[in-house]
């Protein structure tokens, strides 16, 4: 029995496997910073994790998803203040007892070295130098992301 998140992920993957021409984001919108194929927006107000998630959604974006350690380092290089923490799109799934990205995938244990406990109501934040487990109710800043894609982007199965 698949969860609703898993079903959604399957649907998304199936639609990606079709040959499509879809409109995309050629350049980062004003106030968004380009990092490779993404646009990032660093908030300067604070919110608990859930509100941060909702804010990114209103901006037609998502909380930051980090693919690997290299992307983490490049993101951290954009953080100019050592003392500031930012929410990303990763929290602890109690039912699966694992860190889960908001796109439904699980954290590869080698990707991030998390300081703190993996437990209920824990969400992940990043600073200039580290990755932390924090209570999701903690009010800190957050990072939203938009994917940069070519305007004419033909997608082929298994490409």
């Amino acid at each position: 029995q698949k969860s609703s998140i898993e079903k959604c992920s399957v649907d998304i993957q199936q639609s990606r496997n079709k040959t499509t021409e879809r409109p995309g984001l050629l350049n980062c919108p004003i106030y968004w910073q380009q990092l490779r194929e993404k646009c990032l927006l660093f908030s300067h107000t604070v919110n608990p994790w859930n509100n941060s998630l909702a804010d990114c959604s209103t901006k037609e974006s998502s909380l930051l998803l980090i693919r690997d350690k290299d992307e983490l380092i490049h993101t951290q290089n954009l953080i100019r203040d050592k003392a500031i923490l930012f929410w990303i799109g990763l929290n602890f799934s109690l039912s699966e007892k694992n860190w889960k990205w908001i796109n439904g995938s699980f954290l590869n244990s080698n990707d991030l070295e998390i300081r703190g406990d993996a437990k209920e109501n824990s969400c992940i934040s990043i600073s200039q130098t580290s990755v932390y487990s924090e209570y999701c109710s903690t009010e800190i800043r957050w990072i939203c992301q938009k994917e940069l894609t070519p305007v004419r982007n033909k997608v082929y199965p298994d490409s």
């Epitope: 004003i30 106030y31 910073q33 660093f42 300067h44 209103t58 954009l78 100019r80 203040d81 500031i84």
Partner: antibody, heavy 116, light 107 residues
Framework: QVQLQESGPGLVKPSETLSLTCTVS????????WSWIRQTPGKGLEWIGY???????NYNPSLKSRVTISVDTSKNQFSLRLSSVTAADTAVYYC??????????WGQGTLVTVSS | EIVLTQSPGTLSLSPGERATLSCRAS???????LAWYQQKPGQAPRLLIY???SRATGIPDRFSGSGSGTDFTLTISRLEPEDFAVYYC????????FGGGTKVEIK
């Protein structure tokens, strides 16, 4: 309460560079976007550009070739430089805290006249 | 660039009356990224509304914003003497541009 104060010469000669500084008090300049806006009787309010730390800046396309905005976090200040000025650049110049697109705190404004 | 046209240019009303100010965009404003400001002579503009309808901190509830796409409205439900001023709309969905302003004067 965040307060902003513009400072700089009130008179600039044509073809020279206009330089203004905005000092922020009552809060840290770090982690926020900061903008310059000007107001003329002819063109009304016109956004000039913003700075975010020193990693990101963006300028009004119509002024982009002449504008530089910089920040000095140690002094809690940010600055505007507008080169090759003409009489059309005569305006009241405001600095403001930029909430990624709208402006919640403004300086009181400083009149800059371009004249020989 | 998105051009914002405000109407009317001048609105002559009495205290206690309702003021309706219009701001029309030359193209759709993304995500209702529109703000309203009040400016009095010799002062800087003051933020009233952002996101088309959210009141800024400390702004009385007689000020309300509405609209989406290309048509936006600022309503002052009951004019107080201190509300007579010039009002500007500003979009921040695509670069940043301001409207030409509407002057609300005492009739």
């Amino acid at each position: 309460q965040v307060q902003l104060q513009e400072s700089g010469p009130g008179l600039v000669k044509p073809s020279e560079t206009l330089s203004l500084t905005c000092t922020v008090s009552g809060g840290s300049i770090s982690g926020y976007y900061w903008s310059w806006i000007r107001q003329t009787p002819g063109k009304g309010l016109e956004w000039i550009g913003y700075i975010y730390y020193s990693v990101s800046s963006n300028y009004n396309p119509s002024l982009k070739s002449r504008v530089t905005i910089s920040v000095d976090t140690s002094k809690n200040q940010f600055s505007l430089r507008l080169s090759s000025v003409t009489a059309a650049d005569t305006a009241v110049y405001y600095c403001a805290r930029d909430e990624t697109g709208y402006f919640d705190y403004w300086g009181q404004g400083t009149l800059v006249t371009v004249s020989s | 660039e998105i051009v914002l046209t405000q109407s009317p240019g001048t609105l002559s009303l009495s205290p206690g009356e309702r003021a309706t100010l219009s701001c029309r965009a030359s193209q759709s404003v993304r995500s209702s990224y529109l703000a309203w400001y009040q400016q009095k002579p010799g002062q800087a503009p003051r933020l009233l509304i952002y996101g088309a309808s959210s009141r800024a901190t400390g702004i009385p509830d007689r000020f309300s914003g509405s609209g989406s796409g290309t048509d936006f409205t600022l309503t002052i439900s009951r004019l107080e003497p201190e509300d007579f001023a010039v009002y500007y709309c500003q979009q921040y969905g695509s670069s940043l541009t301001f409207g030409g302003g509407t002057k609300v004067e005492i009739k």
